[in-house]
């Protein structure tokens, strides 16, 4: 079953390589268990950046070594991706799955283009 997912078209990462965006899904019914996955599409290749499953009303828990953190509020998930560099510029797609209770719903956003600009190295102060 399909579900609409909205996310911003463009986000500029901070000078510290942090990008945040909101992923919002139009839930057809109430879910108690939701999975959010961030996918990166670059050069027609799609790779999984991070994923978290959470109980509604609880915090998202990504793996300890994940570059993602997030919070949820209703049908919105606030995602933050850290440690980004210029080479990580690309389209970041939000995938939302309503896992429990059934039926299963799947929604995939159109993607957020994240631009990352590496900071200029500080000049030597002689």
């Amino acid at each position: 079953k399909a579900m609409h997912v909205a996310q911003p078209a463009v986000v500029l990462a901070s000078s510290r390589g942090i990008a945040s965006f909101v992923c919002e899904y139009a839930s057809p019914g109430k879910a108690t268990e939701v999975r959010v996955t961030v996918l990166r599409q670059a050069d027609s290749q799609v790779t999984e950046v991070c994923a978290a499953t959470y109980m509604m009303g609880n915090e998202l828990t990504f793996l300890d070594d994940s570059i993602c953190t997030g919070t949820s509020s209703g049908n919105q998930v606030n995602l933050t991706i850290q440690g980004l560099r210029a080479m990580d510029t690309g389209l970041y797609i939000c995938k939302v799955e309503l896992m429990y209770p059934p039926p299963y719903y799947l929604g995939i956003g159109n993607g957020t283009q994240i631009y990352v600009i590496d900071p200029e190295p500080c000049p030597d102060s002689d």
Epitope: T32, T37, E97, M99, Y100, P101, P102, Y104
Partner: antibody, heavy 118, light 111 residues
Framework: EVQLVESGGGLVQPGGSLRLSCAAS?????????WSWIRQAPGKGLEWIGD???????YYNPSLKSRVTISRDNSKNTLYLQLNSLRAEDTAVYYC???????????WGQGTLVTVSS | DIQLTQSPSSLSASVGDRVTITCRAP??????????LHWYQQKPGKAPKLLIY???NRATGIPSRFSGSGSGTDFTLTISSLQPEDFATYYC?????????FGQGTKVEIK
């Protein structure tokens, strides 16, 4: 008619790995249902291992999550179960099954027996 | 995890008897008016077979002597008139919350 046939069972050494296959016929595994692996130790009840959704997402029982991988080959219409670091308590008949929209298991394979012993 | 408790664990009955098996959950497995509780029959050496889904709906091809009822935490599988082919083990299963869990089973034996 949906038919599921498991294979790959047999005797495995403790600490080893198993890779089971489940060949589906009469229905495409990408056609909107979810597919599961369930096991049953000799004389015991049923234990859900995990699922692969039609979207390709996988979902595992937390009690086995660190040791299990479920995958599929769409071109062969086949599901796979990989279980690592096997121990005696993994001895069981392993079934694959199809989940309906409300997560009842409406079609089952005949099962394949895995025995973990030295 | 939602641990389902079936009772009795086993029972002896005769052909023609009415048999009732119960399945109890520690919390409700209902959501928006639907019960995520299913029943299976398993015969020795065979895979389980879906009998009843969503607490009260008979699966395709299941005889009308099998019926399911209940909601919330308490569910019942009833065989109105036991037939020789009904001697088997019966399991309930919840799909309300992950991980999916099964009851420990009820073995129906010939008296």
């Amino acid at each position: 008619e949906v038919q599921l046939v498991e294979s790959g069972g047999g005797l495995v050494q403790p600490g080893g790995s198993l890779r089971l296959s489940c060949a589906a016929s009469g229905y495409s595994i990408t056609s909107g249902h979810h597919w599961s692996w369930i096991r049953q130790a000799p004389g015991k009840g049923l234990e859900w291992i995990g699922d692969i959704y039609h979207s390709g997402s996988t979902y595992y029982n937390p009690s086995l999550k660190s040791r299990v991988t479920i995958s599929r080959d769409n071109s062969k219409n086949t599901l796979y179960l990989q279980l690592n670091s096997l121990r005696a308590e993994d001895t069981a008949v392993y079934y694959c099954a199809r989940k309906d929209d409300y997560y009842a298991f409406d079609y089952w394979g005949q099962g394949t027996l895995v025995t973990v012993s030295s | 995890d939602i641990q389902l408790t079936q009772s009795p664990s086993s029972l002896s009955a005769s052909v023609g008897d009415r048999v009732t098996i119960t399945c109890r959950a520690p919390q409700s497995v209902d959501f928006h008016g639907k019960s995520f509780l299913h029943w299976y029959q398993q015969k020795p050496g065979k895979a389980p077979k879906l009998l009843i889904y969503d607490a009260s709906n008979r699966a395709t091809g299941i005889p009308s002597r099998f019926s399911g009822s209940g909601s919330g935490t308490d569910f019942t599988l009833t065989i109105s008139s036991l037939q020789p082919e009904d001697f088997a083990t019966y399991y309930c299963q919840q799909s309300y919350r992950s991980p999916i869990t099964f009851g420990q089973g009820t073995k129906v034996e010939i008296k």
